[in-house]
């Protein structure tokens, strides 16, 4: 009951962190500044991974993609494929954790499987949170170098003056938004891969043995072969190993009353 | 890199007018802001006026009710309509473009200035 609870939970924490991540990178509110300020209107801009936005005290508002721009930062588009690593990733990671929902029954899908595909989605979860906390950590880095770099400076360009603008800017709320996201994918991943540990099956079978007593009437108890099930006699899984033992592909069966499969 | 061409400017009798005009050409991203401010012999640069991107548009005290500016958003051009000079209008012209960069901080593009003498 617990590990169908953690399971389940780990889920359902994993879907809001990943739509959190899809909602934060189709966000526009990446970062944010003032652009413009006088006594009359402020121009208020607000940019994301795929568009920059402005907009007016007066209401006026006008969105630009970067397509247009040729020299975007290379950051940006780290920043781009991490986000989407991270969708990508935690899309396939959902879809396979639906299948290894242990209250879903498709099938007849063993334990071990649900297991494997349980702790497949867990790691996948992982890596997705992972790529969007990065990703959202380079953006906020490449901001605060940005502007340290673009502080008030004047030179010469062609035709007069340019100066850099000192303007006060904000991270924005998706930021945020990405960084509690990839948090919660993180966490519902590692509840995966927790709820995984208890799906397991508990007993290890191995291949099965046949045991052929050596001209003594002495039955050997194959109870070692099986873990901790307190199976037989042997109960402190000590094998119990005769020379004359052999896998069931290497014995040719005859019929004998020593023999114990 | 943004190249501003300014024009318009020269010698006008007082309560006379005058129409400045200042074209932005390069490659950049998006202007924010165009606006003019003057620079009188011996003074500092002040503001004249100045639109925005949406059409608003700022006054300074010493020319409002006397001058328009207005803006064509598709040519990035500004031009600055000034109407009953005076004397004490005798100034260097300088046009301003404030340019959007993406993920820096803006940049303000300067011309070179057209000078307007107002005398009789």
């Known amino acids: 009951m617990a590990v169908t609870a953690c399971q389940g939970l780990g889920f359902v924490v994993s879907l809001i962190g990943i739509a959190g991540i899809i909602a934060a990178t189709c966000m526009d509110q990446w970062s944010t500044q003032d652009l413009y300020n006088n006594p009359v209107t402020a121009v208020f801009n607000y940019q994301g991974l795929w568009r920059s936005c402005v907009r007016e005290s007066s209401g006026f508002t006008e969105c630009r993609g970067y397509f247009t721009l040729l020299g975007l930062p290379a950051m940006l588009q780290a920043v781009r494929a991490l986000m989407i690593v991270g969708i990508v990733l935690g899309a396939i990671g959902l879809l396979v954790s639906i299948f290894a929902l242990k209250c879903i029954r498709i099938g007849s899908m063993e334990d071990s499987a649900k297991a494997n595909m349980t702790l497949t989605s867990g790691i996948m979860f992982i890596v997705s949170g992972l790529c969007a906390i990065a990703g959202v950590s380079v953006f906020a880095n490449m901001l605060v170098t940005n502007f340290w770099m673009s502080t008030a400076n004047m030179y010469t360009g062609m035709g007069g003056m340019v100066q850099t603008v000192q303007t006060r800017y904000t991270f924005g709320a998706a930021l945020f938004v990405g960084w509690v996201a990839g948090g919660l994918t993180l966490i519902g991943g590692v509840m995966m891969c927790i709820a995984c540990r208890g799906l397991a099956p508990e007993e290890t079978n191995y291949k099965a043995v046949s045991y052929h007593a050596s001209g003594h009437s002495v039955a050997y108890k194959p109870g070692g072969f099986k873990a901790s099930t307190g199976f037989g006699s042997n109960t402190k899984n000590k094998k119990i190993y005769d020379g004359g033992a052999r896998t069931e592909d290497e014995v040719q069966s005859y019929p004998s009353k020593h023999d114990y499969v | 890199e943004v190249q501003l061409v300014e024009s318009g400017g020269g010698l006008v009798q007082p309560g006379g007018s005058l129409r400045l005009s200042c074209a932005a050409s390069?490659?950049?991203?998006?202007?924010?802001?165009m606006g003019w401010y003057r620079q009188a012999p011996g003074k500092g640069r002040e503001l004249v006026a100045t639109?925005?991107?949406?059409?608003?548009?700022y006054y300074a005290d010493s020319m409002k009710g006397r001058s328009t500016i207005s803006r064509d958003n598709a040519k990035n051009t500004v031009y600055l309509q000034m109407n009953s000079l005076k004397p004490e209008d005798t100034a260097v012209y300088y046009c301003?473009?404030?340019?959007?960069?993406?993920?820096?901080?803006?940049?303000?593009?300067w011309g070179q200035g057209t000078l307007v003498t107002v005398s009789s």
């Open positions: 301003n473009v404030r340019v959007e960069v993406p993920f820096m901080a803006p940049n303000d593009y």
């Open positions: 390069g490659s950049f991203f998006r202007i924010v802001a």
């Open positions: 639109i925005t991107r949406g059409g608003s548009t």
